[in-house]
């Protein structure tokens, strides 16, 4: 089942996806697509990286972090109801059927208040309970006991005060990444 994320119309949506490169600069191609991850590649690609850089990008879809260090999280700017749906983050590990596939469900809610056109802070209202844990074998999805003991309601409240980047870093620091190699 997909992990669910929420954002309001007019906000930025944040979809986290991380991996740990086997060695500095030893990057793995990553694609983001609209729709569940197919058998190969990404369907309806919105952003793609290769072993060096972003090589395909579409309007409103941005890499949110330091992708050279494995933070391939996606920001979708100024979301509308049409942005609801499943998104695929695919970490294209070399070898047959080695790819790591993450399906993330984005739920867009109508705006409670009219958002300001320019914001210094953007956030996604909910963060995952299920994340891929760091490990050397096949990635295994499970609830992370090491995450801070905060429920979704609390995170939703905190999100108004904390940057999505800060929470994302906290999640990653808790071990919410996969290691390549």
């Amino acid at each position: 089942s997909e992990v669910e994320y929420r954002a309001e119309v007019g906000q930025n949506a944040y979809l986290p996806c991380f991996y740990t490169p086997a060695a500095p600069g030893n990057l793995v191609p990553v694609c983001w697509g609209k729709g569940a991850c197919p058998v190969f590649e990404c369907g309806n690609v919105v952003l793609r990286t290769d072993e060096r850089d972003v090589n395909y990008w579409t309007s409103r879809y941005w890499l949110n972090g330091d992708f050279r260090k494995g933070d391939v999280s996606l920001t979708i700017e100024n979301v509308t109801l049409a942005d609801s749906g499943i998104y695929c983050c695919r970490i294209q590990i070399p070898g047959i059927m080695n790819d790591e596939k993450f399906n993330l469900k984005l739920v867009i809610k109508p705006a409670k208040v009219t958002p300001a056109p320019t914001r210094q802070r953007d956030f996604t209202a909910a963060f995952p309970r299920m994340l891929t844990t760091r490990g050397h074998g096949p990635a295994e999805t499970q609830t992370l006991g090491s995450l801070p003991d905060i429920n979704l309601t609390q995170i939703s409240t905190l999100a108004n005060e904390l940057r999505d980047s800060r929470l994302a870093n906290d999640l990653r620091d808790s071990g919410a990444t996969i290691r390549i190699g």
Partner: antibody, heavy 122, light 109 residues
């Protein structure tokens, strides 16, 4: 060829205001985060402010927060910096700089303008 | 807040190798970018993402980053390399871009 051309600098009294502009050409302006970086005479580079490609999100150094406002007009390929409540310590050459492709914050500064001098003095 | 530390100056003879460091807590976990600035001119990107070189930058310029130190290496130094060099990172916890305070590279002779 990528070009960034700043304008709007000059002499202003403490407490005054100034608006800097940066005219961009040679690339798809709306696809890139943009920043302002300043350098006081003989001093280090200091990042001032950044704005996402669409203009939807803005970021400021603590030293200018609440006084400076970054904005952009993608139809005119122009970046702006509105500077209010100017102080002597804001005296610097102000550069506009383009971020990297496909990244929300820009990550690094691939291209720079030649800068415009802002002098705050009575 | 995150701090980047650079030596104020480095001196090197022509033809030798100059190494300019940039220190920061676990800086190896961040991407580091390097700029060259000559007097009266705008900065120029010379290394990005730790070790990548923009087109037009000589192969003599290289970079590395691990642990608490990033290093810009200039081999076979020439008189024209004399400049200030700045390291830069994006601190995602504050969403601020940070620069080191620069290192003045002096080419002797």
């Amino acid at each position: 060829e990528v070009q960034l051309l700043e304008s709007g600098g000059g002499l202003v009294q403490p407490g005054g205001s100034l608006r800097l502009s940066c005219a961009a050409s040679g690339f798809t302006f709306s696809s890139y985060a943009m920043s302002w970086v300043r350098q006081a005479p003989g001093k280090c580079l200091e990042w001032v402010s950044a704005i996402s490609g669409s203009g939807g999100s803005t970021y400021y150094a603590d030293s200018v927060k609440g006084r400076f406002t970054i904005s952009r007009d993608n139809s005119k390929n122009t970046l702006y910096l509105q500077m209010n409540s100017l102080r002597a310590e804001d005296t610097a050459v102000y550069y506009c700089a383009r971020g990297s492709y496909g990244t929300y914050y820009g990550n690094y500064f691939e291209y720079w303008g030649q800068g415009t001098l802002v002098t705050v003095s009575s | 807040s995150y701090v980047l530390t650079q030596p104020p100056s480095v001196s090197v003879a022509p033809g030798k190798t100059a190494r300019i460091t940039c220190g920061g807590d676990n800086i190896g976990g961040k991407s580091v970018h390097w700029y060259q600035q000559k007097p009266g001119q705008a900065p120029v990107l010379v290394i990005y993402y730790d070790s990548d070189r923009p087109s037009g930058i000589p192969e003599r310029f290289s970079g590395s980053n691990s642990g608490n130190t990033a290093t810009l290496t200039i081999s076979r130094v020439e008189a024209g390399d004399e400049a200030d060099y700045y390291c830069q990172v994006l601190d995602r916890r504050s969403d601020h871009f940070l620069f080191g305070c620069g290192t003045k590279l002096t080419v002797l002779g």
